[in-house]
Each structure stands twice: as structure tokens, then as C-alpha cells.
Interface confidence: low
């Protein structure tokens, strides 16, 4: 009995096509874009996600210094390869022939080369600093009813497990959310920081990825959490490998 | 063998605190969520909160935020649940839970229960 | 909160016999990722709770299968095969999709 069995639909990922074709009726959801069956009960991989985004019609002083190592997601969006079991597969290439290596959750760490470019194995992104700021209030949030609705939130929507909510700092206005989760940690079942990380960044930027969900509201002690810019650093468990050019540029 | 110990019963005056203890062992304590529940005479059960000893992350009950206080000692795989400004309705037997994620945000195994009464 | 109402609060069965339990909720226990966080608990006299059905209808390690647990949405039943005198306490049905809440429990009584 699947998740997405009472009205064939998957409320974790609205990018799907259902249909009743599964083992004795059952309902069973495909990716769009790659057309791999997922799991309704828990978060989409964000490879799987990204590729469906891609095949879908366009529209129109206490906070964490990220490491020297820390990337962020300039590349944008990309038409990813995704592996049998919804991962990103190490080396990622466009139509031109341009390859590029990635990390786990899909962003580039090396510089980009050719067809003969070599990504020996997926570099697991063990360390995720979500910083967020929010759009001014009559006064600063108390630090602790943030920390604890911001845990709530990745432990009840995401279904994250605490122990990978490594911090939560708060300086008005911005706001960090530490994510930690080195693959020993990472067991069988438990959501991948780097999902639960897409699926919040949709969600704060008003473009849910449950389906018929309403959008998040976020709360703290009745006060809305309204965030006007978020910026993501990916830390790898091998740091990443650019070329001096663009370390200076 | 996972087992979770609680403390004796505590009888105590009303506006006072009280600390119950929690002593867990056939399990890695700090990979487990330890939530605490009320159970009034009535019988009814009342979640209070959790805490995750890995990292201290805890969440309550809207009704007993400012009432309970949760702390974990790691090193001696105990749990702690202090109550606050105790009156006579917070007369109950207290639940330590581990909670098991994998089987989907449940509570698999339960203390002995510490019984407490608030009286003048 | 969350409101689960049990039915009925007390049951009295003769051994052998099967027994039913109802759990009904004031929302709808389906998570957003698709779950149903719904459990029961039976709580014999004197002892404290043990579960016995987690996620509607997965038996816990050691529970016997004449307990069975199912339903959906906000309607969930507990059913008890072959009653036998173990069985004997008071049911709790509870939720962790919202806030974690209980029902009033139902209590199993031998004729």
C-alpha cells in the first residue's frame, strides 16, 4: 500500500504522473522528466526534481562564516543526469559537451572541462548553511521560539531527523540553519539534508513541491517569518577543486 | 535489552519544582528523541515534549512550554524532565518514551512511570 | 490538538472471541509526505504502555498477529483476533502527524 494509493496522486511531489498501473492496482507515481517510479512516503531526490523542473513547461557575529571551501549554486539550472536510484550521477555534461563534476546535491565542484573529464565518485555534501534573511518586524524574534518552530518545521514537514539540525543562529535579521549529515550518520530511511535543504528552499520561495499543499507559513509565537533572500553554502566532505583563475577572479 | 529507568515517586508542595530522571540502557542514548508523557488519574495521556541528546534540540506541547524543563546527561545516558510552579493539578504519573523514527515517529519503549503528588 | 476519540470506552469479550476498538480524529492523520502517523498502545493494569501497532497497521517486533490495525484519513480500528486473558487493559489510539495527541483509551474486560 503506497503512500499515493487513496486518490493516486503523491503528496510529496507534485511533479509526478500517477496512475493505478503498480502491483494489483495499486497506484504508482513516475518523476516527470525521467520517468523513474518514487517513493510517495518521503522526499523526492532533488536530482529527480531538478530534471522534472527542466522537462516542465516554462513559465515567465554569532552567524557561521562559510568555509573557504563553502560552494553556492551559481550555475543555476541544468538538466541533470540522475542515476537508478535518483542520485546525481558524479559527472554532469550539457548538450554542447561541456562536463563538469558535481557534489550530492548537484552543484558544480570542479571547473568545467570535456568529454574526457574524469568525476571518480559522487563527493557527499555533509555540510549545508542555510542563510535567510527576513523582512524587518516590529522587533527582533526571540532566538529561542525560532530555533524551535525552525526544527519543528524540518522535523514535521521534511520529516528530518533532529540530530541533522546541527545549529540554528539568529542575528536580525538573518537568520542560519546548520544542516549536518556525514554519510556514517546517514542510515537507511532517513532523509538526505540536501532534500530536505531544495524542498525548504522551494517552499520558502512560495513554490511548494507538496502536492496541494498551501504554501509554508511560517510562524513564530503568531509573528509571520517572511523571508525576502535566501542563500545556500554546500560544504563537501572532499573539498572542492577549481582552478586558481577562478579563486581569484 | 532496551530499558528506560525513572525515578521514585516524589511527593511535593504546591509552587515548588521537581526533577525526575531518566535512565536509558541497550541503546545508543543519544541517537533516540526522548519524549515525556502525562498521565492523569482519568487515565487520559498527555504528550509533554522531546529532547535529542545528540544536540539538545527539543520541542513541547504549546501547554507545558514554561512549565517543563527537559535536559539530557549524555555521559550517564539519562534524561531529565523538571517541572515548574507545581500545583495540585499537575498530580500524575510521568512517562519517559524512547521515540523511533523508523517506526515512523512513534514510542517504542516506555519507562516504569514516576508517580507525583502535589500536596500541602 | 488533535482530537482522537475512542469507541467504545470499555469492551467486555469472552476469551476466544474477537474484539474491535475504533480511533477516530479531528483531521486528517495523512502527512504531507504521505504517511500516516497513527499507533496504538496497550496499557495493562499496573504496567505502563506498550506498542503495539505503529503507522495504522505495522506490528511492532514481538507483537502477536492476532492484533491488526487499519483505516485512513480520520477512521482507524484496532481488531483483536481470538481474545485471550494477556489482552486484558486499557487500548490507546494516538497520532504524531500534528502534535502528538492521544485518545481517551478503551478498556478490555473478559466476560
Known amino acids: 500500500h503506497t503512500a499515493a494509493q487513496d486518490n493516486c496522486t503523491c503528496p510529496t511531489n507534485k511533479m509526478t504522473v500517477c496512475s493505478p498501473d503498480g502491483p494489483g492496482g495499486r497506484c504508482q507515481c513516475r518523476a516527470l522528466g525521467s520517468g523513474m517510479a518514487v517513493d510517495c512516503s518521503t522526499l523526492t531526490s532533488k536530482c529527480l526534481l531538478l530534471k522534472a523542473r527542466m522537462s516542465a513547461p516554462k513559465n515567465a557575529r554569532t552567524l557561521v562564516r562559510p568555509s573557504e571551501h563553502a560552494l553556492v549554486d551559481n550555475d543555476g539550472l541544468y538538466d541533470p543526469d540522475c542515476d537508478p536510484e535518483g542520485r546525481f550521477k558524479a559527472r554532469q555534461c550539457n548538450q554542447t559537451s561541456v562536463c563538469w563534476c558535481v557534489n550530492s546535491v548537484g552543484v558544480r565542484r570542479t571547473d568545467k572541462g570535456d568529454l574526457s573529464l574524469r568525476c571518480d565518485e559522487l563527493v557527499r555534501t555533509h555540510h549545508i548553511l542555510i542563510d535567510l534573511r527576513h523582512r524587518p518586524t516590529a522587533g527582533a524574534f526571540n532566538h529561542s521560539d525560532l530555533d524551535a518552530e525552525l526544527r519543528r518545521l524540518f522535523r514535521e514537514r521534511y520529516r528530518l531527523h533532529p540530530k541533522f539540525v546541527a545549529a540554528v543562529h539568529y542575528e536580525q535579521p538573518t537568520i542560519q540553519i546548520e544542516l549536518r549529515q556525514n554519510t556514517s550518520q546517514k542510515a537507511a530511511g532517513d532523509v538526505d539534508i540536501g532534500d530536505a535543504a531544495y524542498y525548504f528552499e522551494r517552499d520558502i520561495k512560495g513554490e511548494s513541491l507538496f502536492q496541494g499543499r498551501g504554501g509554508l507559513d511560517l510562524r513564530v509565537r503568531g509573528e509571520p517569518l517572511q523571508v525576502e533572500r535566501t542563500l545556500i553554502y554546500y560544504l563537501d566532505e572532499i573539498p572542492p577543486k577549481f582552478s586558481m583563475k577562478r579563486l581569484t577572479a | 535489552e532496551v530499558q528506560l529507568q525513572q525515578s521514585g515517586p516524589e511527593l511535593v508542595k504546591p509552587g515548588t519544582s521537581v526533577k525526575m530522571s531518566c535512565k536509558a540502557s541497550?541503546?545508543?542514548?543519544?541517537?533516540?528523541?526522548m519524549n515525556w508523557v502525562r498521565q492523569s488519574h482519568g487515565n487520559s495521556l498527555e504528550w509533554i515534549g522531546y529532547i535529542y541528546p545528540n544536540n539538545g534540540a527539543s520541542g513541547f506541547n504549546q501547554k507545558f512550554k514554561g512549565k517543563a524543563t527537559l535536559t539530557v546527561d549524555k555521559s550517564s545516558s539519562t534524561a531529565y524532565m523538571e517541572l515548574h510552579s507545581l500545583t495540585s493539578e499537575d498530580s500524575a504519573v510521568y512517562y519517559c518514551?524512547?521515540?523511533?523514527?523508523?517506526?515512523?515517529?512513534?514510542?517504542?519503549?516506555w519507562g516504569q512511570g514516576t508517580s507525583l503528588t502535589v500536596s500541602s | 490538538d488533535v482530537v482522537m476519540t475512542q469507541t467504545p470506552l470499555s469492551l467486555a469479550v469472552r476469551l476466544g472471541d474477537q474484539a474491535s476498538i475504533s480511533c477516530r480524529s479531528s483531521?486528517?492523520?495523512?502527512?504531507?509526505?504521505?504517511?500516516?502517523?497513527l499507533h496504538w498502545y496497550l496499557q495493562r493494569p499496573g504496567q505502563s504502555p506498550k506498542l503495539l501497532i505503529y503507522?495504522?497497521?505495522n506490528r511492532f517486533s514481538g507483537v502477536s498477529d492476532r492484533f491488526s490495525g487499519s483505516g485512513s484519513g480520520t477512521d482507524f480500528t484496532l481488531k483483536i483476533s481470538r481474545v485471550e486473558a494477556e489482552d486484558l487493559g486499557v487500548y490507546f489510539c494516538?497520532?504524531?502527524?500534528?502534535?502528538?495527541?492521544f485518545g481517551g483509551g478503551t478498556k478490555l474486560e473478559i466476560k
Open positions: 518514551a524512547r521515540e523511533q523514527d523508523n517506526s515512523g515517529y512513534c514510542f517504542d519503549y
Open positions: 503507522k495504522v497497521s
Open positions: 494516538s497520532q504524531t502527524t500534528h502534535v502528538p495527541t
Open positions: 483531521l486528517n492523520l495523512v502527512h504531507s509526505n504521505g504517511n500516516t502517523f
Open positions: 541497550g541503546y545508543s542514548f543519544a541517537d533516540y528523541s
